[in-house]
Interface confidence: low
């Protein structure tokens, strides 16, 4: 056997080159036939009325033909024949690759709630061979479950990803990425997650700055509540007691003027949105005012007093998150 060919893989719409090569030429006739065994070229003559076939080279040792605008129907075995005695035959297989026509990502819900499991589907339509779909959440690769549908030698792949979302996932892209021999580089589509989560509540003491609350002083607390959607309600209550009459509530701020011992207690900031409720507690302890000593008549005495105040803020969440205790020494 001294007739040789090579298999050809080509992307749909591109050019395939078929070559029939003769090792030891004796000027025998070379012929190229299509999968239906119709003659494409007999020597340098083309009897087939398909102008997509063009002669690239003809000699006693090679018949080289190009096929432009290859379609899936061109796939199959092409036969080279060498009319020696006895005749020789060799075949080359043309494989046509079809990139996915369309890549669609479909997310079950536009907006998800933290802790919820959502379904994301990605479909790569009409490719050959079947497309491999990979999933990423941000940079992390995740596992999807793929189903392949075949229709007339073409494959549609749908991959399903079940995703449990957390508040940190808000704004993170979910990426469907395609791997296919006809696709160079990255073919991908993505959707950004929108995750709603219950408020996180923090109380900040904005006055007095040094944190020591004495009788007669003023106290101002600011409640910061962050959630998605932004908390609609931020309210102050006094736990197990009425709010002092001289307390002023202004949006997220609680202002108590002229503190006295009866103001001692726990003040709670509550915040809620459509996802849930959360609160943070501030324990107020009012200290005695600083004592003033009248100037002595004869002797001078120096007294040094050290006062330690502990300011405690307890954060809690009604949805079962861990609380945190912050203690500041002065």
């Amino acid at each position: 056997q001294n007739l040789f060919t090579k298999d050809v893989t080509v992307i749909e719409g591109e050019v395939a080159t078929i070559s029939c090569q003769v090792n030891k030429s004796d000027d025998s006739v070379i012929q190229l036939l299509n999968p239906n065994r119709q003659t494409i070229y007999f020597r340098d003559f083309r009897p087939l009325k398909d102008s997509r076939f063009q002669l690239l080279n003809f000699s006693s040792s090679e018949l080289k033909v190009s096929l432009t605008n290859v379609s899936i129907s061109d796939e199959g075995r092409y036969f080279c024949q060498l009319y020696t005695d006895p005749p020789q035959e060799s075949y080359t297989t043309i494989t046509v690759l079809v990139p996915p026509r369309n890549l669609m990502i479909d997310i079950q819900k536009d907006t998800a709630v933290e802790g919820e499991e959502i379904e994301v589907n990605c479909t790569a339509m009409a490719s050959k061979p079947a497309t491999t779909i990979r999933w990423f959440k941000g940079n992390t690769e995740l596992k999807g479950k793929s189903e392949v549908e075949e229709w007339s030698d073409m494959y549609t792949v749908t991959s399903q990803l079940m995703l449990k979302v957390h508040k940190e996932d808000d704004g993170v892209p979910v990426i469907c990425q395609v791997e296919h021999p006809a696709v160079t580089g990255n073919l991908q589509t993505q959707r950004y997650l929108e995750v709603q989560y219950k408020p996180q509540v923090h109380i900040q003491m904005t006055y007095p700055l040094q944190g020591l609350t004495r009788e007669g002083d003023a106290l101002e607390l600011t409640c910061e509540a962050i959630g998605k959607p932004q908390p609609v309600m931020v309210t102050w209550v006094r736990v197990d007691d009425e709010m002092p009459q001289h307390a002023v509530l202004s949006g997220p701020n609680l202002f108590i003027n002229n503190l006295n011992k009866t103001d001692n207690g726990t003040y709670r900031c509550e915040a809620s949105n459509i996802v849930g409720k959360a609160h943070s507690d501030y324990m107020l302890y009012v200290y005695d005012p600083p004592t003033t000593i009248p100037p002595p008549t004869t002797t001078t005495t120096t007294t040094t007093t050290t006062t330690t105040t502990i300011l405690t803020i307890i954060t809690d969440s009604r949805a079962g998150e861990e609380g945190s205790i912050r203690a500041v020494d002065h």
């Epitope: 959440k137 941000g138 940079n139 992390t140 690769e141 995740l142 596992k143 957390h166 940190e168 996932d169 808000d170 993170v172």
Partner: antibody, heavy 116, light 111 residues
């Protein structure tokens, strides 16, 4: 020939900053990420971080703030600060993400010893 | 942070098949990879994306994954397979993206 060689490992005292360099041959850093992994003597492997072709970096939570990865066209640096004796380890650089198809080229490693 | 659990040591007779396991809650959704490391050498990638083998790795090494467990199977164990084997995976939510290695399994080939 594709190869990676780490350098810069030496004996340092606690608190001393140190920069390790991974010199790259035959690998296009505009096409591949590069990872740093370390291994304390007699212990297992520990991921430090990765730098992608775009220049974006990701770090292990314990390394964030203390370790910085940067690159030129032929080198990848690992800058380490506030070193403690716990950081004594052989440091490897490797092509690609850990677990990635291209993560099959690793350097021989360079030893960092932190001791007072 | 999450933990990948591997048995500390496993023994296999020469020529036999051995399976090394790696378990973690994240493995049901994240891919596992496997590395072989011999004393004084850098790790070598054996398996990536649960089951894929880089070129040059003998087909005696194969990977599989089911639920929370990834498995590296070595068929026809050879003396040269004696080494530490590490599994690894990635996981993360939002910007906290992490790669983690298991503690490693020391494989001893006897006979």
């Amino acid at each position: 020939q594709k190869q990676l060689v780490e350098s810069g490992g030496r004996l340092v005292t606690p608190g001393t900053p140190l920069t390790l360099t991974c010199t790259v041959t035959g690998i296009d850093l505009s096409s591949h990420g590069m990872s740093w992994v370390r291994q304390a003597p007699g212990k297992g492997l520990e991921w430090i971080g990765v730098i992608y072709p775009s220049g974006s970096t990701w770090y292990a939570s314990w390394a964030r703030g203390r370790f910085t990865i940067s690159k030129t066209s032929t080198t990848v640096d690992l800058k380490m600060t506030s070193l403690t004796t716990e950081d004594t380890a052989t440091h490897f650089c490797a092509r690609g993400d850990v677990g990635g198809a291209d993560n099959n080229i690793w350097g021989p490693g360079t030893l960092v010893t932190v001791s007072s | 942070s999450f933990v990948l659990t591997q048995p500390a040591s496993v023994q296999v007779d020469l020529g036999q098949t051995v399976s090394l396991t790696c378990t973690a809650e994240t493995l049901s959704r994240s891919y596992a990879s496997w590395y072989q490391q011999k004393p004084g050498q850098a790790p070598v990638l054996l398996i990536y994306r649960d089951t894929s083998r880089p070129s040059g790795v003998p087909d005696r090494f194969s990977g599989s994954s089911s639920g929370n467990t990834a498995t590296l199977t070595i068929s026809g164990a050879q003396a040269g397979d004696e080494a530490d084997y590490y599994c690894a995976t990635s996981d993360g939510s939002g910007s906290s993206y992490q790669y983690v290695f298991g503690g490693g399994t020391q494989l001893t080939v006897t006979g």
